[in-house]
């Protein structure tokens, strides 16, 4: 972001047009239809989490601030994936996180105002891996060889902008996972990340290029 003052203005709840660019994290959506105050109606929030990606189109939840209903209303619209993968380290073990996966994805989609889903591996399974307590290198070898304690999950997410880009104000969609990660980091830095899942780390990663073909 070229304009250095944008970091001071990110949390001022006023539209600063010079800062409303992807590089400047859209001025925290302050220039965007009521800005940050446009959140999912608390009356609908629980309902929209319950019905997120449930296979039924709920128009009341099919809004950016409610997470686009998990794309239930967009099955006929082709996917438009942002570049890269959003990688979150969440301090909840995988089985616990997956139990509340719809709520997790709905809330994160609402924060980023676009659609998120788990990246799938070659076997069609969600890419949610155990995150182990980092062990100090000074520990005795025998201690280190015990199964390390799982204290969280490493979660790989895809960003699908198909509805974000269709919305009237479509200039705020994250073009890549890194810009979404930067936005979450900025929210966290100014203590405005209203997300009940404890995040340890957020980053964007490029997709691995395809394996080079082996010459015959």
């Amino acid at each position: 972001c070229e304009a250095l003052q944008c970091w001071r203005l990110f949390n001022n709840s006023r539209c600063d047009p010079a800062c409303s660019s992807p590089a400047c994290l859209y001025d925290n959506f302050d220039c965007h239809a009521g800005g940050r105050e446009r959140t999912c109606n608390p009356v609908y929030e629980k309902y929209c989490a319950d019905h997120f990606a449930d296979g039924r189109c709920d128009q009341g939840c099919n809004t950016e601030e409610c997470g686009w209903d998990g794309l239930d209303c967009a099955s006929e619209v082709p996917a438009l994936l942002a570049r890269g993968v959003l990688v979150l380290t969440v301090l909840l073990p995988p089985e616990e996180l997956l139990r509340s996966s719809a709520d997790f994805l709905q809330r994160l989609s609402a924060i980023l105002r676009t659609s998120l889903r788990f990246r799938l591996d070659a076997h069609g399974q969600a890419m949610v891996f155990p995150y182990h307590r980092p062990s100090p290198g000074s520990e005795p070898r025998a201690r280190r060889e015990l199964a390390p304690e799982v204290i969280g999950s490493v979660v790989m997410l895809e960003i699908d902008n198909r509805l974000c880009l269709q919305s009237p104000e479509n200039d705020h969609c994250f073009p890549d996972a890194q810009s979404a990660a930067d936005y979450l980091g900025a929210l966290s830095a100014v203590e405005r990340l209203d997300f009940p899942y404890p995040l340890r780390d957020v980053r964007g990663e490029p997709l691995e290029p395809p394996e080079p073909s082996v010459p015959l």
């Epitope: 319950d50 990606a53 296979g55 189109c57 099955s75 509340s100 788990f118």
Partner: antibody
Framework: QVQLVESGGGLVKPGGSLRLSCAAS????????MHWVRQAPGKGLEWVGR??????????DYAAPVKGRFTISRDDSKNTLYLQMNSLKTEDTAVYYC??????????WGQGTLVTVSS | DIQMTQSPSSLSASVGDRVTITCRAS??????LNWYQQKPGKAPKLLIY???NLQSGVPSRFSGSGSGTDFTLTISSLQPEDFATYYC?????????FGQGTKVEIK
Amino acid sequence: QVQLVESGGGLVKPGGSLRLSCAASGFTFSTYVMHWVRQAPGKGLEWVGRIRANAYGGAADYAAPVKGRFTISRDDSKNTLYLQMNSLKTEDTAVYYCARAEARYRDVWGQGTLVTVSS
Amino acid sequence: DIQMTQSPSSLSASVGDRVTITCRASQSISSHLNWYQQKPGKAPKLLIYAASNLQSGVPSRFSGSGSGTDFTLTISSLQPEDFATYYCQQDYHTPFTFGQGTKVEIK
């Protein structure tokens, strides 16, 4: 064409286990939410549970009478939905249907498989 | 859990009759109400979704109305193939629940 075929039903003793399968064809199974519904002989329909697509965590929800005893899972590589039933009771005797939920309500149901729990 | 209560539990009618079946939810379910038809030995068939929307391929003599807690399925002119059991179902909150069914028999 779009089709769901249940299998795995049969006679089992109370306390026993059974795994039902639902083979899907004619559509992209991996993207759909899938349900199990049952119907005891001569009785009404009862929702058993559902499972979301793996891209949304593959999380399952259950009706109270089966929670903790039944597990819904899916294998997208085999286009198959499963219902693992443990600690079966006589009141679990029913025809079990799998069904596909669809945003535009083009629902699809299987023909059902009969599970009889009796000593 | 949301309880769904259908009435009547059974009715006798003649071909050409207008038939009305009601369904009441124990709490508001907005318009998250579906109607199914089931014939003996067959899987249920969706007739009406979201309280009033006719499923494609279903004859226009079937209609649904209502919102909140009270809903109605109407068959404007009963045909021989309509003799079956009808169920309402809410999909507002899990666990999804069905009414106990209404059996429509020939008078």
